[in-house]
Interface confidence: low
């Protein structure tokens, strides 16, 4: 094949090599960019910046090599459009630093930075960590910080991600209230901070205020749906990102629902209770307090992480006719109480006779062994009769 005279020449089926001295000052409009999986750039002293727009359209890129060039700056979002990137070689350029954000979200198997005049600062703590943890082939490079010594030896005591403290109201929050949250951000080299409110939806009207180092968030006209929803404060500095999530407890009165008993392994009277704080529960049976036992007990289902409602069962282990009756669930919290009742019939009472049925006149005292499967009532040895009044 004839030598390629262009700045960039095809290499294999989906590669491109740009090695002609000083031919590039940016990576715009590379030929066949959409299908490229490998891009090799060398000897491009005018290529000093790598920005988001430079790699737009290179969605299939797996390997990127920019070596022996003039690269001074790689934007934190430079590889946003190349999520499949797995090998990145930026050796022998003029890079003093590289943000942790640049590699965030990528699954880099290899990152080569040797031969750059790196400046040891907290901004390279992430790279030091990669070196410590043996990631991306970094340890083998024995990276040096220009005029400071090995990156591995950089003291990192003061290189921490931001510290976040979110202040939530101490007092009880009621439905309809306005709530002010404050996120206090501390740390070195703070860059950005904000709130993540994706879970809130219709739980409140949201108003943000303030900025670093103190962010305000007003949740106006809160609803009970706000309970169990995460409100997250985040902050970033040159070392990394920190997040803290809090939840606002919105008080609302107890409510309760009962459903028709269903037979499962045991019988179950399904219920749902809601309220904040979580209500205390009490069962009544035919108007009297039901004392729970190992045969009759309350069982909760695993709660959903993002809601206050609790679902469960009153479990009845092989109930008989004596358990038939009216079940009432009482739920109470400091803001209100509620109850719901349901009739449950588990088994017919064998001693309740229909007047139309044949009437047994007596039980023989001699017939002490029942063959019918029905219970035999035997109080003493004296014969007795049963009379039925038909009105």
């Amino acid at each position: 094949a004839a030598p390629c005279p262009d700045a960039c020449c095809p290499h294999g089926s989906s590669g491109l090599r740009c090695t002609r001295d000083g031919a590039l000052d940016s990576l715009h409009h590379l030929p066949g960019a959409e299908n490229l999986t490998e891009l090799y750039i060398e000897n491009q002293q005018h290529l000093q910046h790598l920005e988001l727009r430079d790699l737009r359209g290179l969605g299939e890129l797996r390997n990127l090599t920019i070596v022996k060039s003039g690269l001074r700056f790689v934007a934190p979002d430079a590889f946003h459009f190349t999520p499949r990137l797995s090998r990145l070689n930026l050796s022998f350029n003029a890079l003093e630093s590289l943000s942790w954000k640049t590699v965030q979200g990528l699954s880099l198997q290899e990152l080569v930075l040797s031969g750059n005049p790196l400046h040891c600062s907290c901004a390279l703590r992430w790279l030091q960590r990669w070196e410590e943890e043996g990631l991306g082939g970094v340890p083998e490079q024995k990276l040096q910080c220009h005029g400071q010594g090995p990156l591995a030896h950089m003291p990192n005591a003061s290189c921490g991600v931001p510290t976040l403290k979110v202040q939530v109201p101490n007092a009880s929050v009621d439905v309809g209230d306005d709530v002010l949250l404050r996120c206090q951000v501390e740390g070195r080299g703070l860059e950005q901070a904000g709130w993540i409110l994706t879970e809130l939806e219709q739980s409140a009207t949201v108003m943000k205020s303030g900025g670093l180092p103190s962010l305000g968030l007003t949740l106006a006209n809160v609803t009970s749906d706000l309970n169990r929803k995460n409100v997250t404060c985040w902050a970033e500095n040159d070392v990394g990102r920190a997040e803290v999530s809090v939840q606002v407890n919105v008080s609302f009165p107890a409510s309760v629902q009962l459903h028709t008993a269903v037979e499962m392994h045991h019988w179950c009277i399904p219920f749902s209770v809601d309220g904040q704080p979580a209500p205390s529960l009490r069962w009544l049976f035919n108007g009297s307090v039901l004392n729970e036992t190992s045969f009759i007990f309350t069982e909760f289902l695993e709660p959903a992480a993002n809601e206050t409602v609790r679902h469960g069962c009153l479990r009845l282990n092989q109930p008989t006719h004596v358990n038939n009756g009216n079940y009432t669930l009482l739920a109470a919290n400091p803001f209100g109480q509620a109850s719901a009742s349901i009739m449950a019939a588990f088994m017919d009472n064998p001693f309740e006779f229909n007047p139309e049925d044949p009437i047994p006149v007596s039980f023989s005292p001699v017939d002490t062994n029942s063959t019918s499967g029905d219970p035999v009532e035997k109080k003493d040895e004296t014969p007795f009769g049963v009379s039925v009044a038909v009105g």
Epitope: H153, P155, A157, E186, R188, G189
Partner: antibody
Framework: QVQLVQSGAEVKKPGASVKVSCKAS????????MHWVRQAPGQGLEWIGT????????SNAQKFQGRVTLTADTSTSTAYMELSSLRSEDTAVYYC????????????WGQGTTVTVSS | DIQMTQSPSSLSASVGDRVTITCRAS?????LYWFQQKPGKAPKPLIY???NLASGVPSRFSGSGSGTDYTLTISSLQPEDFATYYC?????????FGGGTKVEIK
């Protein structure tokens, strides 16, 4: 040239607080960590804590948590170390020292402030 | 915390002597720092990052070592060298100092 000048000697009663100042000059105050170190009579050097005046980020030795407060006033390039609930064993010379990140060491020290705790 | 142990705690020497002070860390550190302190004065930096002389420090002072064992050497002791010497690490948080070595006139 780079200089750190500390406030004068203090005599305090047990239970009181003391606030020592350290005025910096000759460099950009906000871009270097300021550390505090103390030395009890006839004893060695003990690290107290550090503050980054650029954003008031600070950290203290576990031993002093809750008793020491480090602050910095960027308008006057002055760092402060306040130690509360003083006890007799806090009698010491207290030094401020700049952490020179280019070479990772405490390169300039204040002249020291003697704090005596006595009833 | 990393403990720094200096030895000896004191020594007597004459002008012109070669003096060696050792410092041992309880776990490996990358660099060591040495300070000189005279009575009533603040510590003065001597050596940073194990072997680099701080500004204005005479070349008779030298530092060496790695891992847990480090050494400060004064090749030919001068009258102004009688003082207490401290080692210090800041490889690991928090920074810690050795107990000091007092160099006295024999």
């Amino acid at each position: 040239q780079v200089q750190l000048v500390q406030s004068g000697a203090e005599v305090k009663k047990p239970g009181a607080s003391v606030k020592v100042s350290c005025k910096a000059s000759g460099y950009t105050f906000t871009t270097y960590w300021m550390h505090w170190v103390r030395q009890a009579p006839g004893q060695g050097l003990e690290w107290i804590g550090t503050i980054y005046p650029g954003n008031s980020d600070s950290s203290n030795a576990q031993k002093f948590q809750g008793r020491v407060t480090l602050t910095a006033d960027t308008s006057t390039s002055t760092a402060y170390m306040e130690l509360s609930s003083l006890r007799s064993e806090d009698t010491a010379v207290y030094y401020c020292t700049r952490f020179y990140y280019e070479d990772w060491y405490f390169d300039v020290w204040g002249q020291g402030t003697t704090v005596t705790v006595s009833s | 915390d990393i403990q720094m142990t200096q030895s000896p705690s004191s020594l007597s020497a004459s002008v012109g002597d070669r003096v060696t002070i050792t410092c041992r860390a309880s776990s490996s550190v990358s660099y060591l720092y040495w300070f000189q302190q005279k009575p009533g004065k603040a510590p003065k930096p001597l050596i940073y990052r194990t072997s680099n002389l701080a500004s204005g420090v005479p070349s008779r002072f030298s530092g060496s070592g790695s891992g847990t064992d480090y050494t400060l050497t004064i090749s030919s002791l001068q009258p102004e060298d009688f003082a207490t010497y401290y080692c210090q690490q800041y490889h690991s948080y928090p920074p810690t100092f050795g107990g000091g070595t007092k160099v006295e006139i024999k």
